[in-house]
């Protein structure tokens, strides 16, 4: 204030944020601050976070004479102490028929046979544990596998010699290999029968299957 004007410390009040001014001398004042503020003119917000009670990785966010906890996604509540039920919030949290199981601070998926991963989205590679005979090709399926055999091999694991290789079926019959035992099966054309379709049959009889 200039020398020609009368200085009154509390007029106007220098106190901010709702602080009340009290004149303490001819040229001095004191601000009585509202809770949550400090400073000679109540200009400074008091940081309420130093003694915060945010738990489970919650981050303290200072307010005016209070604080809030910013919780990680798995937790909720004033101090991040309440578990979030992810199974309720995300009905499709587990894929491919997996069952959601809520846990403290997270959730887990119980996957059906053939699937794995946090959300059961990964098809288990059954070929990793398959015993297809060397030289054959393993094809992964859901909870199973199949072996693609090279020429001359047969069976579920391509571990058998293919009996059809020697063309045992005659008269243009169709030759198949029994995947269990590797033996040939001849599907005879009309008019023929027998293990290798070499026998004539009576008219009226249809196709014959013979196993050997």
């Amino acid at each position: 204030a200039g020398s020609d004007s009368l200085y009154v410390p509390c007029a106007p009040s220098p106190c901010v944020n709702g602080g009340t001014c009290r004149q303490t001398g001819d040229f001095t004042f004191e601000c009585n601050c509202l809770p949550g503020f400090e400073g000679s003119t109540c200009e400074r917000n008091i940081d309420d976070c130093p003694n915060h009670r945010c738990q489970n990785g919650g981050v303290c966010v200072d307010g005016v004479n209070t604080y809030n906890c910013r919780c990680p996604p798995q937790w909720t509540g004033q101090f991040c102490t309440e578990d979030v039920d992810e199974c309720l919030l995300q009905p499709n949290a587990c894929q491919n028929g997996g069952t959601c199981a809520n846990r403290n601070g997270g959730y887990g998926c119980v996957c059906v046979n053939g699937w794995s991963g946090d959300d059961c989205s990964e098809n288990i590679d059954d070929c990793a544990f398959a015993s297809c005979t060397p030289g054959s090709t393993c094809i992964d399926r859901v909870a199973s596998f199949s072996c693609m055999c090279p020429e001359g091999k047969a069976g579920l694991l391509c571990h058998l010699d293919d009996a059809c290789i020697s063309n045992p079926c005659h008269k243009g019959a169709l030759c198949d290999t029994n995947p269990l035992n590797g033996q040939y099966i001849c599907t005879c054309p009309q008019g023929y029968k027998g293990a290798d379709c070499t026998e004539d049959v009576d008219e009226g009889n249809s196709h014959h299957h013979h196993h050997h």
């Epitope: 220098p14 001398g25 004191e30 601000c31 400090e38 400073g39 000679s40 200009e43 917000n45």
Partner: antibody, heavy 120, light 107 residues
Framework: EVQLVESGGGLVQPGGSLKLSCAVS????????MEWIRQASGKGLEWIAA??????????VYSASVKDRFTISRDTSKSTLYLQMNSLKTEDTAVYYC???????????WGQGTLVTVSS | DIQMTQSPSSVSASVGDRVTITCQTS??????LAWYQQKPGKSPKLLIY???RLQDGVPSRFSGSGSGTDYTLTISSLQPEDFATYFC?????????FGGGTKVEIK
């Protein structure tokens, strides 16, 4: 006229101690918050400590970088603010300023600064 | 701690130019911002407090504005004595934090 004059700076070895003083005049010392701020050569300003006014029991707050190593205090009878610096590190090398917190979010008076060099 | 992002870090200008410096805070500081001028080898000098209030004795070509997290210092017509480094500082809560500074240089 408000005046702040720092002294006590100098060369000190790492791990050593130094006490800075800030003599003030021209205002009622006990009515104001007082701050210490430092500035490394060619760098920005870094607040390091504050002592609140008498109405707030002269309570103290420190920055994380100096907490447990530096101590701020004042002697109202001598109108002097102090900064006791212990366990000094090379990164404490800077010009140290004392300033008056004028309220209303401004540091309205500063000393001329005193240079502290921490080196072996 | 409240982070202060000041830009630009330097600006080249001529006498008479209008210069604008900005300061962004990491959270709302409710206008609790000050601007300082510092010349080489000297201590900082308070220009603006409370985001927009001019400190006694500071020329009116300096002005401050802003609220929330965005603040601006404007020098309406640059004078030879204004070539210096300018800092913003939040006084809303401890620890007090400063911007990195803006050096105003002669073009």
């Amino acid at each position: 006229e408000v005046q702040l004059v720092e002294s006590g700076g100098g060369l000190v070895q790492p791990g050593g101690s130094l006490k800075l003083s800030c003599a003030v005049s021209g205002f009622t010392f006990s009515d104001f918050y007082m701050e210490w701020i430092r500035q490394a050569s060619g760098k920005g300003l870094e607040w390091i400590a504050a002592q609140r006014n008498k109405a707030n029991d002269f309570s103290i707050v420190y920055s994380a970088s100096v907490k447990d190593r530096f101590t701020i205090s004042r002697d109202t009878s001598k109108s002097t603010l102090y900064l006791q610096m212990n366990s000094l590190k090379t990164e404490d090398t800077a010009v140290y300023y004392c300033s008056r917190d004028g309220g209303r979010w401004g540091l309205d008076a500063w000393g001329q600064g005193t240079l502290v060099t921490v080196s072996s | 701690d409240i982070q202060m992002t000041q830009s630009p870090s330097s600006v080249s200008a001529s006498v008479g130019d209008r210069v604008t410096i900005t300061c962004q805070t990491s959270e709302d500081i409710y206008s609790g911002l000050a601007w300082y001028q510092q010349k080489p080898g000297k201590s900082p000098k308070l220009l603006i407090y409370g985001a927009s209030r001019l400190q006694d004795g500071v020329p009116s070509r300096f002005s401050g504005s802003g609220s929330g997290t965005d603040y601006t210092l404007t020098i309406s017509s640059l004078q030879p004595e204004d070539f210096a480094t300018y800092f913003c500082q939040q006084g809303f809560k401890y620890p007090l934090t400063f911007g990195g500074g803006t050096k105003v240089e002669i073009k």
